[in-house]
């Protein structure tokens, strides 16, 4: 079904996130005693890393366009704090329709 | 088609419990593509959005912060309707309180409202 | 919370007539707004969603625009089952606000 499809898509995604975050890391020399917000995979989306301060933007995960195929995609952002990651905005149920990712059960 | 069917009392006293049921016919308050919400509107606060409940997997709610400390908004999937409490009421909520399904569709939306209820907060 | 403002508060106008009413945002929402009319003593039935989107069922007299913090509903060629009141409601952020409302009467 759908579901068993998007539990192989958010694997795959997972994987080429946190591939993602290591090549970012090493180019922006960032470690883990770095200022800043470290690269991280929310279980929804993959977030790069960021210096004090940026604002980073991603589009809704490609999965809301099985559900959604003919609509544009919506965008989240998040600010790197001195505290680290803030919350999204707007939350992914908002913008995207969908708010955590759903295992068959 | 959808239907959204309000019942509950028209009069509540002051910093007693308001409690309110929208009986869904035509779709299941568990369909993982909607959200069951509430709303009122009133002369001074016109239309306030309070919260919504949903089913993904698991029942979720979200609640509006003015009143986030006094609601809740529960799922019956054995009569597929849910309900709204709120708690400690005064005068000031005093309004006609809606149900209304949620869809999505580039954002959410409210397509199907029940008929409303007129509330009296009131000694 | 988002404010949502509209203009005019209320408007008077014909059978025949193009009307267009105004919805602004406090702050940028992209696209994520809605449309509803509401007759007296009646719910609010949702007429537009996404800021141009129109709704199964609804007259195609009936359109919106606009992106960002400003936004319009337009009825061309008003009817009589169109005088009614108006509200926009943002759907960005939790909780959801909706506009004072536009009421449209008869001149």
């Known amino acids: 079904g759908s579901m068993a499809h998007s539990d192989g898509i958010f694997k795959k995604e997972q994987a080429m996130c946190l591939e993602k975050i290591q090549r970012a890391n090493e180019l922006m020399g960032f470690n883990d005693s770095s200022p800043g917000c470290p690269g991280m995979w929310d279980n929804i989306t993959c977030w790069k890393p960021a210096h004090v301060g940026e604002m980073v933007l991603v589009s809704c995960p490609e999965l809301f366009r099985i559900f959604n195929p003919d609509q544009d995609m919506g965008v989240v952002s998040r600010n790197c704090t001195e505290d680290g990651w803030s919350e999204p905005f707007p939350h992914y149920f908002d913008a995207c329709g969908f708010d955590e990712y759903e295992s068959e059960t | 088609q959808v239907q959204l069917q309000q019942s509950g009392p028209g009069l509540v006293k002051p910093s007693q419990t308001l409690s309110l049921t929208c009986a869904i016919s035509?779709?299941?308050?568990?369909?993982?593509?909607?959200?069951w919400n509430w709303i009122r509107q009133s002369p001074s606060r016109g239309l306030e959005w309070l919260g919504r409940?949903?089913?993904?997997?698991?029942?979720?709610?979200h609640y509006a912060v003015s009143v986030k400390s006094r609601i809740t908004i529960n799922p019956d999937t054995s009569k597929s309707q849910f309900s709204l409490q709120l708690n400690s009421v005064t005068p000031e909520d005093t309004a006609v309180y809606y149900c209304?399904?949620?869809?999505?569709?580039?954002?959410?939306?409210?397509?199907?409202w029940g008929q409303g209820t007129l509330v009296t907060v009131s000694s | 919370d988002i404010q949502m403002t509209q203009s005019p508060s209320s408007l008077s106008a014909s059978v025949g007539d193009r009307i267009t009413i105004t919805c602004r945002a406090s702050?940028?929402?992209?696209?994520?707004l809605n449309w509803y009319q509401q007759k007296p003593g009646k719910a609010p039935k949702l007429l537009i969603y996404a800021a141009n989107m129109l709704q199964s069922g609804i007259p195609s007299r009936f359109s919106g625009s606009g992106s960002g913090t400003d936004f319009t509903l337009t009825i061309n060629s008003l009817q009589p089952e169109d005088f009614a009141t108006y509200f926009c409601q943002q759907a960005i952020n939790q909780p959801y606000t909706f506009g004072p409302g536009t009421k449209v009467d008869i001149k």
């Open positions: 702050q940028y929402i992209v696209r994520y």
């Open positions: 409940t949903y089913y993904r997997g698991k029942w979720k709610n």
């Open positions: 209304a399904r949620g869809m999505w569709n580039q954002n959410w939306f409210l397509d199907h």
């Open positions: 035509g779709d299941s308050v568990s369909n993982k593509q909607a959200t």
